[in-house]
């Protein structure tokens, strides 16, 4: 029997420093968590004390803090090297700065493979980025060698943006003819790493014949076998065990995001290459673990330039941007709005001519909405001044939910109105009406969405059973603020990009903002 | 087939710069890194510097950052070193090649030979 | 600057011997190390990269291994065409740094 330990971490989203528990920026040192540094300290303890070791990373390093806004994937190249990743596959958010901002920084100066079997190019891209990435790769471990198929979401060209010269395939489609290569090959030990989500990932283990381990990235799914070390709650036991359609028993693992672990598994193969048993749980890097010194010396040369970068101007008002509780926790107010308009530009995505964009709508809790910026300071706008309106770190996500899950969200965002709660929600692509004079539950009395498959947007009623789109901050997409029916029954939820980062880089492309407050949400007394 | 053609010979006056020049084919020019390596006669090798097609970005080995300049045209897919002040120091061969994917040095020209002779 | 030192400088070997050429980093370099083979008037070709993982199109005679400052390429059975100067190169850290070369003769 040859044992081979595998070390992976997925969604990592530019969490290159050590970070507080949920993620956010670490205040606390001694209760932070993850980092770069940290990581490599458990990497290099692991491989010193095991003989065949290999570390990959399933997609998303890219975007998630000031990190990939300032650097733009240079420190994800720098820091993966520095931690001799070997291989990663390539995640959907590896496309937010165009194929461009993925090639310069990062397809060309990393110094491991970059995988993904399902992504195909075409037209004058196809010559241009013709093995910077690969379908698969065969590395050698100890005296075997193992065989590493990577994979895409499909959904990516929703999600990000790869232009239109990329061909995102069926996963499974994909995949198995290169697994059938790797065979021909004499490759007996098969890794299919990927980020197509923690469903996917099962049905990868189930369908193509050959792969003989699956991680996955995407969902930040969280598996752990006895009792978990932190606050995430286990969706299966460590590794998910899958049983193939050929009668095999696939291990499928992933582990959470940003970090904050260290996905450990151990695999025992015969000589036949099948697997004879696969055990492990992620480690959480907590600070118990030391910080590695000349990982976190070279972390904090680099730090330098993002304290610069978050005092530059982005971009100015001229309005006063109302920012207050006072105002965003009780009607509409234009930072709400603005940070709505922001979210949508910042999906915007012409995939289909029926449709002027994928998504129009926009929702957002007003008590995320933390400060406002006058704009008596010259009007300027720096990063500093976002972080005090957006301080939690969190992301913009695309969900998919049914018209009547709305309408319950909407109802949610009134039903103890007056209270100064921070489930009032700011809009973007919808027109409500509140009677607060109806029983709490029955106070939406109009409700009405930008239409999407038109040319001429224009707002149409709210149809119950139809699906629609949403933008939202991933704090609702997880039922925060009492939005328990959104993370309920949301039919699709993909991570997106970072809240800060969207506004910036919308504030940078007007120049000049001037949001106002426009009617998007209206109160009204008695029969409409 | 991917090539990077070098020419075979160049011979200068002390004193005088040369530009050697390495002409890309068979793959998108401005997709990878192209590095320049310095073989003296009978010696091992040594590498100059490196530059970036698409952007023009260049590194450096400090002992050549005056004696080197690299550039690229883009329209004819070539690489040039301009080696300036030679001396007697500066006959070798020079060598192009390509940084491939994971630093894979993939592909290299033929070299050019440089005699430094008055 | 990282200096590579190779040993030995040049040895002599009889076909079908297994071939142990060492290199040795000033410092830690990651496992980036590179080998590569020349003969006389050619230019370099390259054998393995990342320590370990073998160029395509190279015989599987040929084989890599080494951590931290430590390195070696292991030729399992020496064949004629083996024959020629071999170099290490590390590309951790600019500037990259070859070794002096091991020359290798048919004994």
């Known amino acids: 029997a040859w044992e081979l330990t595998i070390l992976h971490t997925n969604d990592v989203h530019s969490r290159l420093e050590q970070t507080s528990e949920d993620s956010s920026k670490c205040v606390n040192a001694s209760r932070c968590m993850g980092g770069v540094a940290r990581l490599f300290t458990k990497v290099q303890q692991i491989r010193r004390a095991e003989p065949n070791v290999l570390l990959l990373d399933a997609g998303d390093q890219y975007q998630g803090t000031i990190w990939f806004t300032v650097y733009k994937g240079a420190e994800v190249a720098h820091f993966m090297n520095a931690l001799r990743y070997d291989a990663m596959a390539l995640g959907n958010h590896e496309f937010d700065n165009g194929v461009e901002g993925l090639i310069e920084p990062l397809l060309k100066e990393a110094k491991f493979p970059i995988l993904s079997a399902n992504i195909k190019a075409k037209g004058p891209l196809a010559s241009q980025i013709s093995g910077l990435y690969l379908p698969y790769k065969v590395l050698p471990v100890g005296d075997e060698v193992v065989g590493i198929v990577g994979y895409t979401s499909k959904e990516t060209p929703f999600l990000s943006n790869p232009g239109t010269n990329l061909v995102f395939e069926d996963e499974i489609t994909a995949l198995q003819p290169e697994v059938d290569k790797l065979k021909t090959l004499n490759v007996n030990k098969i890794i299919a790493l990927g980020h197509s989500g923690f469903e996917m990932d099962k049905l990868i283990a189930q369908k193509v014949r050959g792969v003989d381990v699956v991680v996955g990235g995407h969902s930040n799914t969280f598996l752990y076998t006895g009792n978990p070390p932190s606050k995430e709650v286990p969706a299966g036991k460590y590794p998910f065990i899958v049983t193939s359609d050929d009668g095999r028993k696939v291990p499928v693992v992933q582990a959470y995001a940003f970090g904050k672990y260290l996905g450990y598994l151990k695999i025992e193969f015969d000589e036949r290459g099948n697997v004879i048993s696969s055990h492990g749980n992620p480690i959480l890097l907590n600070s118990s673990i030391p910080e590695d010194p000349s990982i976190k010396a070279d972390i904090n040369k680099w730090r330098i330039k993002l304290d610069n970068y978050s005092t530059q101007e982005l971009g100015k008002t001229i309005v006063y941007l109302d920012g207050s509780s006072q105002s965003c926790r009780f009607r509409e107010c234009n930072m709400g709005n603005l940070i709505c308009d922001a979210m949508i530009n910042n999906n915007l995505r012409h995939t289909d001519e029926m449709f002027w964009n994928h998504v129009s709508m926009c929702i957002l809790n007003g008590g995320g909405i933390r400060s406002p910026i006058d704009e008596r300071n010259n009007g300027t706008i720096t990063w500093e001044n976002l972080a005090a309106v957006l301080p939690f770190g969190g992301t913009f996500d695309l969900v998919q939910l049914k018209g009547s899950t709305l309408k319950k969200a909407f109802e949610h965002s009134v039903h103890r109105y007056g209270q100064s709660t921070g489930e009032f929600l700011q809009v973007g692509g919808i027109h409500v009406v509140y009677d607060l004079s109806r029983k709490p539950g029955d106070r939406v009395v109009k409700l009405d969405v930008l239409c999407t498959k038109c040319r001429v947007p224009s707002y149409d009623p709210l149809k119950m059973d139809e699906v629609y789109k949403v933008i939202l901050p991933n704090f609702l997409a997880n039922g925060g603020d009492g939005f328990q029916m959104i993370k309920d029954e949301l039919l699709r939820h993909d991570s997106g990009d970072q809240d800060i980062n969207v506004v910036s880089t919308y504030i940078s492309k007007m120049k000049v903002i001037y949001p106002a407050v426009e009617g998007r949400i209206k109160f009204s007394t008695g029969s409409h | 087939q991917v090539q990077l053609q070098q020419p075979g010979t160049e011979l200068v006056k002390p004193g005088a710069s040369v530009k050697l020049s390495c002409k890309a084919s068979?793959?998108?020019?401005?997709?990878?890194?192209l590095y320049w390596v310095k073989q003296r006669p009978g010696q091992g090798l040594e590498w100059i510097g490196g530059?970036?097609?698409?952007?023009?970005?260049?590194n450096f080995n400090e002992k050549f950052k005056t004696k080197a300049t690299l550039t690229v045209d883009k329209t004819s897919n070539t690489a040039y070193m301009q080696l300036s002040s030679l001396t007697s120091e500066d006959s070798a061969v020079y060598f192009c090649?390509?940084?491939?994917?994971?630093?894979?040095?993939?592909?290299w020209g033929a070299g050019t030979t440089v005699t430094v002779s008055s | 600057d990282i200096k590579m030192t190779q040993s030995p400088s040049s040895m002599y070997a009889s076909l079908g011997e297994r071939v142990t050429i060492g290199c040795k980093a000033s410092q830690d370099i990651n496992s980036y190390l590179s080998w590569f083979q020349q003969k006389p008037g050619k230019s370099p070709k390259t054998l393995i990269y990342?320590?370990?993982r073998l160029v395509d199109g190279v015989p599987s005679r040929f084989s890599g291994s080494g951590s931290g400052q430590d390195y070696s390429l292991t030729i399992s059975s020496l064949e004629y065409e083996d024959v020629g100067i071999y170099y290490c190169?590390?590309?951790?850290?600019?500037?990259?740094?070859f070794g002096a070369g091991t020359k290798l003769e048919l004994k």
């Open positions: 068979g793959y998108t020019f401005t997709s990878y890194y």
């Open positions: 090649t390509r940084r491939g994917s994971s630093w894979n040095f993939d592909v």
């Open positions: 530059i970036n097609p698409s952007n023009g970005g260049s």
């Open positions: 190169l590390q590309y951790d850290e600019f500037p990259l740094t």
């Open positions: 990342r320590t370990n």
